[in-house]
Structure formats: C-alpha cells, structure tokens
Interface confidence: low
C-alpha cells in the first residue's frame, strides 16, 4: 500500500471550487460531497455561485468528478498501478484539453490536494472558439451521461501519466457531440509515486437535480473502477 | 463587494472563553475562503484560523490548536471563532477577514485575503 492509499481507506470530504470563462462567460462553481474509494464511489453537488452556469452542466463533469480520480476503485491486483492515491496527501497538477468537435475547446488546470482532512479540487477552466448557438453555449444537450473508458498510461519523463478518452455527450435532437480529452497529471509533491502500466478505468455516471435546491446546481453519482490488467501467471495457478 | 462584522469580542479572566462572530453582507457568494487574524499593540496582523465557505474545511495556526475552533453558518452568512482556555497573550484585536475565490489553498497571510472587518478588542486579564 503506498502512503497516499491509506488516506482513502474511509469515506472523505470533498471540496470542489471552479473559477469559469467561456467565450467572456464568467462563472464560478463550488461543490461538496464525499468519496469512498473502497467502492470508487463519489456522491457531489456542485452550485453555482453566480447565478446561471453559461454551458451545459454535462460540459463539466469530467472537469469535476473525474478530476478526482484518486476515488478510483482499483482492485487488490492492480493497487500498484494507482497513480493517482500514491501522490497524495500532496497532490497532483492536472491539466487538460477538451476539443468539442465541430465547436470550441476548454482548457483546465487543476490542484488536487489533501487540505486538513478534505480532498480539494481547484480548478481554473478558459474556454475559447465556442459557436453562440452551437451545442455547447446554445443548451442543446440532454442532462445525461453516458459510461466512458479513460485511458491511462505512464510520463516517466514528468513522473507523473497521461490520460486519453473520448466523451459522447447525448444532443437533445437525437445526436451525439464528441468531446476529445486530452489530460496531463504531474505530482505537486517530490516523495516517489507509482508509474502504472498501461490500463483504464471505466466510470459510471447519474446526474440528478435536489429539488429543494433554487440554485443552477447539477447532483452527481459515481462510481469508477480500474481495469485491463490482468492477474500475473502466479496468482492464476494459486 | 463583502462587507464584515465582527461581534463578541471583551474582558474574559485567564481559563475562560469567548466566542467570536462575523457577519458577512453583500456578494457573499463570490466567497472561497474566511479567516480570523489578530493584532497585538505593536505587533504584525497574525493568522488565527481560516475555513473553505463552501466544504467547511478548516485549518489552524500552531498557536490556536486544540483550544480554538473555526465554524460557520452559511444560512446566516456567519463565520465564529470559540476560544476556549484562554490566555493573557491571546490579547489583541481580532479581525474577519474574506478571500475571494483563487487559487491559494488554505491561505494564512495576511496579503491573501481581499476584505476585512473593522476587528473587536479581546482582552484577557491575568
């Protein structure tokens, strides 16, 4: 088990602050919520702060939600392959860039830390290119979410990996808008992390509203688990 | 803009304790983060303890470890320091201090925080 794992051994607070601007569009997000990584299991509700979010919440759960995949259930055999739990408590840079096909792109850069005994989640998101009445800034898509793959590989050179998935965002006409994700985490801290071997993690997504909440808010349930590595020969033959 | 009130501060016996409020009014939702800072006659503005307005998370410094704590309200829009096992060098004025959203995490200087109340006098006789 490596040092960070032990801090995920119970259910933990989760702290999500966004700062937002999309084509001038400021906004800012604050959420709350707990994660369980013996189950992969987060449970957030993001509010936001400013008044009417300028894009669609779907837009933004793997800015939230899978920024954290330090919640990640990763089984007995692949916990050496868990990059993500062994750079905490100091935490990790996450960086990305999301190409919306045909519209715009966002681009992130987020802290993910232990602060006390909460998992803070900050994030700064520039988004620029997007069509006023395209997908994105026009509210045309369905609040739903599909279940994705994300696909993780190791950066020896920055010690840290690189992340690759495609996100299938369901459109309110039937369509699909692709959105090409592009992710970098790098360690904040210099103590050793663990480098994995290729692999994935599959996640599940429900989205839901409070409906004693007023605010623009989006209600998010969890579940991500690691898979495509298999066990070694010998614990086929135990 | 935010506006702070504090509130509670006084003359309290060696061993006592006293509990501290402040009211924020105005764009409270642009809000990341709150604070209490004191300042001794002649002294530098000290960080005390600070909370995350959405998660209520808290942090201390050294000194308020174990004897004070950090809590909020966010349906009153109150942050409140209780001070317990008081002692005659926690004397000084207390602020409430506010840090607009950011990217500092657990900011404890003074240079960090963007709007400040006009503090309450805490004195603690021996």
């Known amino acids: 088990m490596s040092k960070g794992e032990e801090l995920f051994t119970g259910v933990v607070p989760i702290l999500v602050e966004l700062d937002g601007d999309v084509n001038g569009h400021k906004f800012s997000v604050s959420g709350e919520g707990e994660g369980d990584a013996t189950y992969g299991k987060l449970t957030l509700k993001f509010i936001c702060t400013t008044g009417k979010l300028p894009v669609p919440w779907p837009t933004l759960v793997t800015t939230f939600s899978y920024g954290v995949q330090c919640f990640s259930r990763y089984p007995d055999h692949m916990k050496q392959h868990d990059f993500f739990k062994s750079a905490m408590p100091e935490g990790y840079v996450q960086e990305r860039t999301i190409f919306f096909k045909d519209d715009g792109n966002y681009k992130t850069r987020a802290e993910v830390k232990f602060e006390g005994d909460t998992l803070v989640n900050r994030i700064e998101l520039k988004g620029i290119d997007f069509k006023e009445d395209g997908n994105i800034l026009g509210h045309k898509l369905e609040y739903n979410y599909n279940s994705h793959n994300v696909y993780i590989m190791a950066d020896k050179q920055k010690n840290g990996i690189k992340v690759n998935f495609k996100i299938r965002h369901n459109i309110e006409d039937g369509s699909v808008q692709l959105a090409d994700h592009y992710q970098q985490n790098t360690p904040i801290g210099d103590g050793p992390v663990l480098l994995p071997d290729n692999h994935y993690l599959s996640t599940q997504s429900a989205l839901s509203k409070d409906p004693n909440e007023k605010r623009d808010h989006m209600v998010l349930l969890e579940f991500v688990t690691a898979a495509g590595i298999t066990h070694g020969m010998d614990e086929l033959y135990k | 803009q935010v506006q702070l009130v504090e509130s509670g501060g006084g003359l309290v016996q060696a061993g006592g304790s006293l509990r501290l409020s402040c009211a924020a009014s105005?764009?409270?939702?642009?809000?990341?983060?709150m604070g209490w800072f004191r300042q001794a006659p002649g002294k530098e503005r000290d960080f005390v303890a600070g909370i995350y307005w959405a998660a209520g998370s808290t942090y201390y410094a050294d000194s308020a470890k174990g004897r004070f704590t950090i809590s909020r309200d966010n349906a009153k829009n109150t942050v409140y320091l209780q001070m317990d096992s008081l002692k005659p060098e926690d004397t000084a004025v207390y602020y409430c201090?506010?840090?607009?959203?950011?990217?500092?995490?657990?900011?404890?200087?003074?240079?960090?925080?963007?709007?400040w109340g006009q503090g309450t006098q805490v004195t603690v006789s021996s």
């Open positions: 105005g764009r409270t939702f642009s809000t990341a983060a």
């Open positions: 201090a506010a840090r607009r959203r950011g990217f500092t995490l657990a900011p404890t200087r003074a240079n960090e925080y963007d709007y």
